[in-house]
């Protein structure tokens, strides 16, 4: 978790002097509770936006937006803590809006936004906005949270972001798999424009089961430049096991930008349809 372009963080707006600060996610009001605390944020919204860095890289960012309730507690609102927790790693990043002037009611509802948390493809985050100071231990909560899931690199708009391109999202191998005679599979796919090796991972399963009955790995050496964007054809020999008929073929590239953590593509061959075998008809009918 990180912030995009840390230098440009702004939270001031007409009628409010405000500064954005790094936060330890442990505001002082936790340790020294105040008697009077503001109410919670209203209408918290999380959107996925895309932002360019100064270097021209494109990153997905969480755009966080909320409004204030129209009650007198804004007189005690000193700021807000924005927290983003990545659920699979428990990593948390916080920033603090520090109000340098007192808020006053004005003709339209106060609205705040922040769009600098960089988020990763296919990750889920808990986004929380906490009004400050935080409530006393038994006080009503004054925060709002949402769980936010970022699309993966298969998504058309995500595909062109820097993290997705770095993991090979622009490569479309267009895998085809056909079953040949004598327990063989022919796998064909389009090579990318990089001199890097590939690995084909074959996993076979029984018709209706999910535990594998055969596994095989096939190494494909790095292509020469004249082979870039050409089709690579590989024939794999299967284990002659009756019923081991559903095959998943996965192609793992080793591009320089993602090494052994590149996006994998896969194709599946289903078991052949079994015709219903009719009851055998005897070739003569006994008469008694």
């Amino acid at each position: 978790l990180r912030l995009l372009d840390h230098r440009a963080l702004v939270c001031s707006q007409p009628g409010l002097n405000c500064t954005v600060k790094n936060s330890t996610c442990l505001d002082d009001s936790w340790i020294h509770p105040r008697n009077l605390t503001p109410s919670s944020p209203k209408d918290l919204q999380i959107q996925l936006h895309f932002a360019h860095t100064q270097q021209g890289d494109l990153f997905p960012v969480a755009h966080i937006e909320w409004t204030l309730q129209t009650d007198a507690s804004i007189l005690y609102l000193e700021g807000a803590e924005l927290s983003v927790l990545q659920l699979n790693t428990n990593e948390r990043l916080c920033v603090r809006f520090e109000f340098l002037s007192k808020l006053r009611h004005h003709h339209r509802r106060w609205r705040f936004t922040f769009s600098h948390f960089v988020v990763d493809p296919d990750q889920e985050y808990e986004v929380t906005v906490h009004h400050l100071p935080k409530p006393i231990p038994d006080g009503d909560p004054n925060h709002q949270s949402k769980n936010f899931l970022v699309p993966d690199c298969e998504h058309a708009r995500m595909k062109v972001t820097t993290p997705c391109m770095s993991s090979g999202s622009l490569w479309d191998p267009n895998i085809t798999v056909e079953t040949l005679e004598a327990h063989q599979l022919r796998v064909s796919f389009t090579l990318w424009n990089e001199s890097t090796h590939y690995q084909i991972l074959l996993t076979s399963f029984p018709h209706m089961e999910n535990h594998s009955c055969f596994e095989h790995m096939h190494h494909i050496p790095a292509p020469r430049p004249e082979e870039f964007h050409q089709r690579s054809n590989v024939t794999l020999t299967l284990r002659n096991l009756k019923g081991c008929c559903r095959h998943q073929v996965q192609i793992q590239p080793f591009f320089s930008s993602c090494l052994n953590d590149c996006l994998r593509h896969s194709a599946t061959v289903s078991c052949p349809e079994m015709p219903d075998t009719p009851e055998p008809i005897p070739d003569y009918m006994p008469l008694w």
């Epitope: 209408d43 999380i46 959107q47 996925l48 769980n147 899931l149 998504h155 058309a156 708009r157």
Partner: nanobody
Framework: QVQLVESGGGLVQPGRSLRLSCAAS????????MHWVRQAPGKGLEWVSG????????DYADSVKGRFTISRDNAKNSLYLQMNSLRSEDTALYYC????????????????????WGQGTMVTVSS
């Protein structure tokens, strides 16, 4: 412009099933997460279920878990809600809702008040 048209509602006996559909137009349907929300007579809006752009993730309110199934067909720009074992408390006006941006929020939409929604389809569960 963006349009969502729900259909499939009606009067049904408790324990029976209904399938709601939502036809979407005016936006790139397969880019966005979608949700079903409902409003019972005289009550507020309640989130029912949500589904990511590629159907990779589906979530349900506790009150419908195990009975309702959300699905989508991106080729047909359509969202569905299969409702089984219907109860009288499922009586409501059902709306399909488009997420405002490309993300997805568990347990509700990422933007409230809801961004884009249709005119709704009425489901009445009564014997």
């Amino acid at each position: 412009q963006v349009q969502l048209v729900e259909s499939g509602g009606g009067l049904v006996q408790p324990g029976r099933s209904l399938r709601l559909s939502c036809a979407a137009s005016g936006f790139s349907f397969d880019d966005y997460a979608m949700h079903w929300v409902r409003q019972a007579p005289g009550k507020g809006l309640e989130w029912v279920s949500g589904i990511t752009w590629n159907s990779g993730r589906k979530d349900y309110a506790d009150s419908v878990k195990g009975r309702f199934t959300i699905s989508r067909d991106n080729a047909k720009n359509s969202l569905y809600l299969q409702m089984n074992s219907l109860r009288s408390e499922d009586t409501a006006l059902y709306y399909c809702v488009k997420e405002r941006s490309l993300g997805y929020c568990r347990g509700g939409t990422c933007s409230e008040p809801f961004h884009i929604w249709g005119q709704g389809t009425m489901v009445t569960v009564s014997s």
